[in-house]
Amino acid sequence: GPVPPSTALRELIEELVNITQNQKAPLCNGSMVWSINLTAGMYCAALESLINVSGCSAIEKTQRMLSGFCPHKVSAGQFSSLHVRDTKIEVAQFVKDLLLHLKKLFREGQFN
């Protein structure tokens, strides 16, 4: 059946922690992605940004999780209003920012 929201959020946090802790070389060879507004619809916005990164084994599981948690189909080059279209950041920074925000949501009990 569907993954409970709290479980989904916790699993995603654990995976992002794993990425940040195990990072040796520049994550995804220093690939840049669009920054996003960390608000409602964040899972889809994060996927829309990260789906444009390919060949990066370190974030494959994160992409899978975000794809499962986003209710609609997302393809490369797709953008929502949640993107800060004039700001690109490294994947490593994107992951750190997302992780901090998800931890905050988890502490506050905001699972959806």
Partner: antibody, heavy 118, light 111 residues
């Protein structure tokens, strides 16, 4: 335009080694995953292994001990090396590039035929 | 390793009729709501061509007569109506777990 082209020795003696090069154009190997797949004459497809853009390498369990995959991103080349060749390694060898997530094999080379025979 | 078993090994379908190919996985290929099963078409003397990804998504440029369905361990590729140019061998492939694996293939003949 995305292109992949395999080049190999054609004929290899049993017990010998095989080296195949996949030369690509139209994209960078630093952000693309390349798979190696083979197909014996008249038979099905067998996944051999892959190298990710970030350098991680995965191998098929059955061939792990005989297989080595590497790349030179600056030359846009991926390499497959196989040791201790047997006659049942005779096949067409393909390199294939994954598309973006969910990483299905979207772009394929034409393949290179390898015969293991004395 | 996840074993993919295709059936039938071969089939002959009349022009304009429906062709149905099955792929059964030895364990689930689902992960976080998606099925990591893909379908390829291979014509004689050519490399494979991606048709369907994530079980049911049509690859760009592939005719709408091709469709995919299924989840967990049971998947189906349907061609309806079959055209003469669809004569080929079809393979399922999973990448839910390493190593990636292919099914044994199904050869489609057009009557």
């Amino acid at each position: 335009e995305v292109q992949l082209k395999e080049s190999g020795p054609g004929l290899v003696a049993p017990g010998g080694s095989l080296s195949i090069t996949c030369t690509v154009s139209g994209f960078s190997l630093t952000d693309s995953s390349i798979n190696w797949v083979r197909q014996p004459p008249g038979k099905g497809l067998e996944w051999l292994g892959m190298i990710w853009g970030d350098g991680r390498i995965d191998y098929a369990d059955a061939l792990k001990s005989r297989l080595s995959i590497s790349k030179d991103s600056s030359k846009s080349q991926v390499f497959l090396e196989m040791t201790s060749l047997r006659t049942d390694d005779t096949a067409t060898y393909y390199c294939a590039r994954d598309g973006r997530f969910p990483y299905a094999m979207k772009f394929w080379g034409q393949g290179t035929s390898v015969t293991v025979s004395s | 390793d996840i074993v993919l078993t295709q059936s039938p090994a071969s089939l002959a379908v009349s022009l304009g009729q429906r062709a149905t190919i099955s792929c059964r996985a030895s364990e689930s290929v689902d992960s976080y709501g998606n099925s990591y099963m893909h379908w390829y078409q291979q014509k004689a003397g050519q490399p494979p061509k991606l048709l369907i990804y994530l079980a049911s998504n049509l690859e760009s440029g592939v005719p709408a007569r091709f469709s995919g369905s299924g989840s967990r361990t049971d998947f189906t590729l349907t061609i309806d109506p079959v055209q003469a140019e669809d004569a080929a061998t079809y393979y399922c492939q999973q990448n839910n777990e390493d190593p990636r694996t292919f099914g044994g293939g199904t050869k489609l003949e057009i009557k």
